[in-house]
């Protein structure tokens, strides 16, 4: 195709035309359409939805829309042998059983194929034993139990409340503590907002509601049987014993009505402090075991789920770029849901659908983006980001050479208070500039910009007059693009005013009550927040695909690198004596950051001055910007986490959802005072400082003048 197509940009075909074409009413219709039946990964219903989306994206005007299928390990409950938990008496009789399903919401009583609550990838088993309450089952909670309270979880069944950290980390921590089973439950303290009714009368979790979810510890591997490579027709699959990230002990989730029955009998120690108490009318005793008259009773789990290799389908749509078709800007979000997916993922999928429609409308009028835009409807995100990861594994060579940016599009809302953005520092200025041009949907901010309401409601902790932008962690489909491949990435959604509860999700998360009506009645009746999120996500994609010079500012990376270096240095300085003894110095890292700052500043000056009409120089400067994120990738990966290769950011080893800066150094320093061989431990700290310093310096040099 002739690159002249790019000149087909009339004033009408600008960002404004794209944004004006986005309609709240369409998002609403798409959401309704996507949420009438369950779309569980690996099911016929989700395959049919994939084909529907393929067909509609073609109608919208994309150049091509293909299905990309993979055969990956999924997990399902046994339909004839349900999972449940019992309290058994000394004779082994079951005197209490947890519920087998969630009471269906009004209007959905006759829907078939609602998967009952389960922890995906739990092994089968029927362990019985004494219960220990482990709070959120975070690393620090197990430290409290084992080191302070001297409570041994070995051979016990632990019960943990959902929230604060990714459930897979909870299970990993329980396994390491020697537990033989894990019960996960939603405590009203975390999933029932005061003053709000439970569904269907409000957006709170009812007592019978349960959060589903996978409990893997994949660390970016994708399909557990084919780490590093696509699960295609000729794939070599590992045996189940060698599969990546599978839990080794049975796990099952319950609601707070059932949790009450287990927790009210708990004996042993009182909880260590107020942070271990939820909102149920129980003492929150830690155990081990039940109190007094109930001390001979035990808890028994009955788990019969099976792991099965199953076909999944991504939908990949292409809108070819007119000038730089070999440069890819990707907008992706998942399609599979646990049940109806009213928020997760369909509030995001509906927004993607409307963005595709708007781009398609412009294309039908003769416009093309400068760069190629790829649209993706990922499958099996809920089972461990499998669809996106397998596709990226299959296309890794193309992506690492051509990938400009990835914008994620899962749930558009987790509240209706303000915007929430997590992204690479390269996108800070893009996000700031874009949100200054968009209208705020917030009450009390009529006629004001989104930037203004966002900054007021969610101010940056470091820079006054600027909004908070968070680090990318994981738990969503950007992971493979950012953490493994080093493609600049970002995500945006509307959130709640609940900073302290950042990683707990909204009350009805992954429950049967996550319906269209939940969104339409309680979260966003006018779909104005969805529209705003569509404008932010779509606007970012438009700019990334269409601006002549990539809208990346490398100076913002310099600023955060200094902040992260200061932070990790201060953590290390909690051990001044050991730093002296083992000659630990951060000089090389600070020197590299200083060099990066100076080189980034000079690069930015050149970026203002160069001749943009020279396509070779333009391409060269853009490539330096595109490849900057790639320069932070260490091909060897992080220790024991080969698919987390970004040296500046990784998902926290203690919470997959959270991002950690300089993760290699951070993990080397973590709990270092408890290491049996301090010399070896501090040696690893020094090695990680070396890796980080080298990487920052190497990245800086990619911004230097090429000759």
């Amino acid at each position: 195709k002739s690159s002249n197509e790019a000149t087909n940009i009339t004033p009408k075909h600008n960002m404004k035309a794209f944004l004006d074409e986005l309609k709240a009413e369409n998002i609403k219709k798409f959401l309704y359409n996507f949420t009438q039946i369950p779309h569980l990964a690996g099911t016929e219903q989700n395959f049919q939805l994939a084909k529907q989306i393929q067909s509609q994206w073609k109608e919208f005007g994309l150049d091509s829309v293909e299905l990309a299928h993979y055969d990956v390990l999924l997990s399902y409950p046994n339909k004839t042998h349900p999972n449940y938990i019992s309290i058994i008496n000394e004779d082994g009789n079951e005197i209490f059983n947890t519920s087998l399903f969630e009471p269906p919401p009004p209007g959905y009583e006759n829907v078939s194929d609602i998967v009952p609550p389960f922890s995906a990838f739990s092994p089968q088993g029927m362990p019985e034993g004494d219960l220990v309450y482990v709070n959120y089952a975070r690393t620090e909670d197990f430290f409290k139990l084992e080191r302070d309270m001297k409570i041994n979880c070995s051979g016990k069944i632990v019960i943990a409340r959902y929230g604060k950290v990714f459930r897979g980390n909870k299970v990993k921590n329980a396994q390491l503590a020697g537990a033989k089973g894990v019960i996960l439950y939603s405590d009203p303290a975390d999933y029932f907002a005061p003053g709000v009714k439970s569904y269907p009368d409000g957006w709170n979790l009812p007592g019978g509601g349960v959060q589903r979810g996978n409990i893997l510890n994949l660390n970016g591997a994708g399909d557990p049987l084919t780490p590093g490579y696509p699960a295609n027709e000729y794939a070599y699959r590992r045996g189940i014993a060698e599969a990546v990230g599978l839990p080794s002990i049975p796990v099952h989730p319950i609601g707070y009505y059932d949790a009450q029955k287990l927790l009210e009998k708990m004996g042993g120690s009182a909880p260590p402090d107020s942070s271990w108490r939820g909102s149920l009318k129980v003492p929150y005793n830690v155990g081990p075991g039940f109190t007094g008259n109930f001390s001979t009773q035990k808890v028994k789990m009955h788990i019969h789920s099976t792991n099965e290799v199953t076909r999944i389908y991504n939908v990949i749509g292409t809108l070819r770029g007119a000038v730089e078709p070999d440069r890819y800007v990707i907008l992706g979000g998942h399609r599979d849901s646990w049940v109806f997916g009213g928020i997760d993922p369909q509030s995001g999928a509906a927004v993607v659908h409307e963005i595709v429609r708007s781009f398609g409308t412009l294309k039908k009028e003769g416009w093309r983006p400068r760069r190629t835009i790829l649209f993706a409807s990922w499958d099996a995100e809920e089972f461990g980001l499998l669809g996106s990861t397998e596709w990226a594994e299959e296309n890794s060579r193309l992506l690492q050479e051509r990938g400009v940016a990835y914008i994620n599009a899962d749930s558009s809302i987790e509240g209706n208070y303000t915007l929430r953005v997590d992204c690479t520092p390269l996108m800070y200025s893009l996000v700031h500039n874009l949100t200054k041009e968009l209208k705020s949907p917030d009450e009390g901010f009529e006629g004001k910009s989104l930037y203004e309401s966002w900054t007021k409601k969610s101010p940056s902790p470091e820079f006054s007059g600027m909004p908070r932008i968070s680090k990318l962690g994981s738990g969503n489909d950007f992971e493979v693009f950012f953490q493994r491949l080093g493609i600049a990435s970002g995500r945006a959604r509307y959130t709640k005013n609940w900073e302290t509860n950042k990683f707990s999700g909204y009350p009805l998360y992954h429950s049967v009550y996550e319906t269209y009506e939940l969104v339409e009645k309680f979260y966003d009746p006018m779909f104005k927040y969805h529209l705003t999120v569509a404008q932010v996500r779509g606007g970012m994609v438009f700019e990334l695909a269409n601006s002549i010079v990539l809208p990346f500012d490398c100076r913002d990376y310099a600023v955060v690198l200094r902040k992260y270096a200061d932070k990790i240095y201060s953590i290390s300085m909690k051990h001044p004596q050991e730093m002296k003894t083992y000659s630990v110095s951060f000089d090389s890292l600070f020197s590299a950051v200083k060099n990066f700052t100076e080189i980034a500043s000079k690069f930015s000056e050149r970026l203002q001055d160069f001749d943009k009409s020279n396509p070779i120089v333009l391409r060269m400067m853009n490539d330096q910007l595109m490849f900057l994120e790639r320069a932070f990738i260490d091909p060897l990966g992080l220790p024991d986490r080969p698919f987390y290769r970004h040296v500046i950011y990784a998902p926290s080893s203690h919470n997959k959802y959270a991002g950690e800066s300089f993760p290699g150094i951070y993990d080397a320093l973590f709990d270092i005072e408890s290491k049996v061989d301090p010399s070896k431990a501090w040696g690893e700290v020094k090695r990680q400082i070396y890796v980080a310093a080298f990487t920052v310096q190497a990245a800086a040099e990619t911004l230097s003048e090429v000759a």
Partner: antibody
Framework: EVQLVQSGAEVKKPGASVKVSCKTS????????IHWVRQAPGQSLEWMGN????????TYNQKFQGRVTITVDKSTSTAYMELSSLRSEDTAVYYC????????WGQGTLVTVSS | DIVMTQSPDSLAVSLGERATLSCRAS??????VDWYQQKPDQSPKLLIY???TRHTGVPDRFTGSGSGTDFTLTISSLQAEDVAVYFC?????????FGAGTKVEIK
């Protein structure tokens, strides 16, 4: 070696407040619960409350009806106990103890409440 | 509040003889009981936690036992340095409560 060093003796008038400090060393401060316990002359021990230094979570003995406040300063590995609206029966030795099971104790701080 | 009742109030035992100290909880506390030793003009020291586990460095002549409501601290062979007041404490429910103490002396 674990050490808890408390601030010196105090003499206070009824109605006043007292703030006792407890500087810890020899272990990871955030790892152990800090408790405050008092012992009136010739009497048994009375638990006042505790704090999780990692997150500031506290639990108080309701007997003290909001008169007691326990805080920590992680940067100096120091815990504090403030008791307000003092009365003569608050005259006691006040101890801090580290560890859920009161594994390590401070040397005690004598607080005398007298008009 | 759970009341911890210690008996006897005081106990005189010959050197090398066994001392048995009792502690009764007003309700079931499982095994959430500690024992402390306080020598004159000193801070208390932890001896036994979780009813029966000796704290680091505590001589093996000190043994804790019991569960539910009845707990015992036994000093198998009393030494001169064991002269002290011994307190039990429950942590099954808040507020944590101590017994009034048993004073151990040499006969």
């Amino acid at each position: 070696e674990v050490q808890l060093v408390q601030s010196g003796a105090e003499v206070k008038k009824p109605g006043a407040s007292v703030k006792v400090s407890c500087k810890t060393s020899g272990y990871t401060f955030t790892e152990y619960t800090i408790h405050w316990v008092r012992q009136a002359p010739g009497q048994s021990l009375e638990w006042m409350g505790n704090i999780n230094p990692n997150n500031g979570g506290t639990t108080y003995n309701q007997k003290f009806q909001g008169r007691v406040t326990i805080t920590v300063d992680k940067s100096t590995s120091t815990a504090y106990m403030e008791l307000s609206s003092l009365r003569s029966e608050d005259t006691a030795v006040y101890y801090c103890a580290a560890g859920w099971n009161f594994d390590y104790w401070g040397q005690g701080t004598l607080v005398t409440v007298s008009s | 509040d759970i009341v911890m009742t210690q008996s006897p109030d005081s106990l005189a035992v010959s050197l090398g003889e066994r001392a048995t100290l009792s502690c009764r909880a007003s309700q079931d506390v499982g095994t959430a009981v500690d024992w402390y030793q306080q020598k004159p003009d000193q801070s208390p020291k932890l001896l036994i936690y979780w009813a029966s586990t000796r704290h680091t460095g505590v001589p093996d002549r000190f043994t804790g036992s019991g569960s539910g409501t009845d707990f015992t601290l036994t000093i198998s062979s009393l030494q001169a340095e064991d002269v002290a007041v011994y307190f039990c404490q429950q942590y099954n429910s808040y507020p944590k409560t101590f017994g009034a103490g048993t004073k151990v002396e040499i006969k």
